[in-house]
């Protein structure tokens, strides 16, 4: 009579997530008499996958009939697979008996399940920098299987250098996460530039998932100020204009001041955008300068998102 | 706890039916046959036929071909056994059995039986 | 289809007696065959399976032995709560067949 073997022929199997796994397992005898059970891991902390005998298994089912007789077929078929079904399975052949006595495993089939990255997020800095400054954008994602992932970084489609990537943990997991920070140095011209975050893996066959962070919210024009005098009209009335040019956001807050004291204030809104993102605007203020003795010192004094107000002023001279 | 629970007794008429069911708990049930054997009164186990809870496939012996059907509803764990054309010779208590083919080739488990009369 | 004949179909015997009962399929089946108790008005029940293997939760008292076509049964000691009706059973191959029963009464 030959000794019993339990054969399990694939040493691995690899399923992408949401497939099923079949795990072959074959007896070279019907001898002696007992069932059939499988178990993920070895040792006392092993886990039942399937036993023919008793239990509830709803995502396993025999790949042959066990009730038919002569059937030395004790595959399994294990549906909709998550990484967290990775691990190495065991097919153990028992003596009945009371209780059942281990007889014989299979060697152990390796099951590892790949799974797609998690569509990449990206986050900015939480507060913005002006031009020439370096920021740090922040790209993650999760979930995937295998290891091995390549991230890449794009400011409006020029690859960049400057950032670190992690890939956790370190050791053997179900699953992985990646994490990448990459630096970015902030120019004027930036309001519409885009970073992307690119992940390609195995298991999207050549298509990388991206994840984009627009400039925008990461990046704080300052305003230029200008402030010029009109002609004098012919009711003494001189107009001053304040030109606030090149900003971003559009957040502002105008003050005139005349001599020291609050003449206006104005908020800008629904402001045209120029090519580059930025706005402009422009502020006027009359003066009567038949009503001051003395020059009118005038200051226009700009509040940008919540920044340090920025002052310029102008002397009106009043003839005598 | 393992079990099968077998329906209520019958009395049938002759040329009537009658659908016996078995009702498994506490394992696996796709994973064993279920037989069913009869016993008449005084007389020695009968085996009728078999069915896989697995597949539904099925096997019937010889003398009862054509009379018999055997089904099972996996939703619920339930063996049914319907027989035909009643005589009186089909008076007896129907048993269900669990049988496990590729590993163990016996009856370890038993319904209590369902007794059929069959009179006119 | 296999034939199992079982000899005696009854035997009287006494608390303490050792009792053999046979069975003789009409063709080789291997280890395939079973012993089953029976009493009045209950289900058969498991005793050896796979001709020589005690069932869980039965006394040692029972034993099985044979292979191909010759089985034996056998009570070493018997005991009060043992008079009852046994059967072998053939598990070889389709139509499963049962022996015809050996009643075993007291003396």
């Known amino acids: 009579e030959e000794e019993l073997q339990v054969i399990q022929p694939e040493k691995s199997v690899s399923v992408a997530a949401g497939e099923s796994a079949t795990l072959n397992c074959t007896a070279t005898s019907l001898i002696p008499v007992g069932p059939i059970q499988w178990f993920r891991g070895v040792g006392p902390g092993r886990e039942l996958i399937y036993s023919q005998k008793e239990g509830h298994f709803p995502r396993v089912t025999p790949v042959s009939d066990p009730t038919k007789r002569n059937n030395m077929d004790f595959s399994i078929r294990i549906s909709n697979i998550t990484p967290a079904d990775a691990g190495t399975y065991y097919c153990v052949k028992f003596r009945k008996g009371s209780p059942d006595v281990e007889l014989k495993s299979g060697a152990g089939t390796e099951l590892s399940v790949r799974a797609k990255p998690s569509a990449p997020v990206v986050s900015g800095p939480a507060v913005r920098a002006t031009a020439e400054h370096t920021v740090s954008f922040t790209c993650e994602s999760h979930g995937f299987s295998p290891r091995d992932i390549t991230l890449k970084w794009f400011k409006n489609g020029n690859e960049l250098s400057d950032f670190q990537t992690n890939v956790d943990p370190a050791g053997k997991s179900v699953s992985y996460s990646i994490r990448s920070t990459a630096r970015v140095v902030l120019t004027r011209r930036d309001v519409h530039s885009q970073v992307i975050c690119e992940v390609a893996h195995v298991t999207l066959q050549g298509d990388p998932l991206r994840g984009t962070a627009n400039l925008s919210e990461a990046i704080r024009v300052p305003p230029f100020l200008e402030v010029t005098q009109q002609s004098m009209r012919a009711d003494n009335q001189v107009n001053v204009t304040c030109q606030v040019t090149k900003f971003y956001p559009q957040r502002l807050q105008l003050t005139w001041l005349e001599n020291g004291n609050v003449s206006r204030t104005e908020m800008a809104s629904a402001l045209p955008e120029n090519k580059d993102g930025t706005y402009n605007w422009t502020s006027w203020l009359l003066v009567n300068v038949s009503a001051h003795r003395d020059d009118v010192k005038l200051t226009c004094q700009v509040e940008h998102d919540g920044q340090p107000a920025v002052n310029k002023s102008f002397s009106v001279k009043v003839s005598a | 706890q393992v079990q099968l629970v077998q329906s209520g007794a019958e009395v049938k008429k002759p040329g009537a039916s009658v659908k016996v069911s078995c009702k498994a708990s506490g394992y696996t049930f796709h994973g064993y046959g279920i037989s069913w054997v009869r016993q008449a009164p005084g007389q020695g186990l009968e085996w009728m036929g078999w069915i896989s809870a697995y597949s539904g496939e099925t096997n019937y012996a010889q003398k009862l071909q054509g009379r018999v059907t055997m089904t099972t509803d996996t939703s619920t764990s339930t063996a049914y056994m319907e027989l035909r054309s009643l005589r009186s010779d089909d008076t007896a208590v129907y048993y269900c059995?669990?049988?496990?083919?590729?590993?163990?080739?016996?009856?370890?488990?038993w319904g209590r039986g369902t007794l059929v009369t069959v009179s006119s | 289809d296999i034939q199992m004949t079982q000899s005696p179909s009854s035997v009287s015997a006494s608390v303490g007696d050792r009792v053999t009962i046979t069975c003789r399929a009409s063709q080789g089946i291997s280890s395939w065959l079973a012993w089953y108790q029976q009493k009045p008005g209950k289900a058969p029940k498991l005793l050896i399976y796979a001709a020589s293997n005690l069932q869980s939760g039965v006394p040692s008292r029972f034993s099985g032995s044979g292979s191909g076509t010759d089985f034996t049964l056998t009570i070493s000691s018997l005991q009060p709560e043992d008079f009852a009706t046994y059967y072998c059973?053939?598990?070889?191959?389709?139509?499963?067949?049962f022996g015809g029963g050996t009643k075993v009464e007291i003396k």
């Open positions: 059973q053939q598990g070889a191959s389709f139509p499963i067949t």
């Open positions: 059995a669990r049988e496990a083919g590729s590993s163990w080739y016996d009856f370890d488990l």
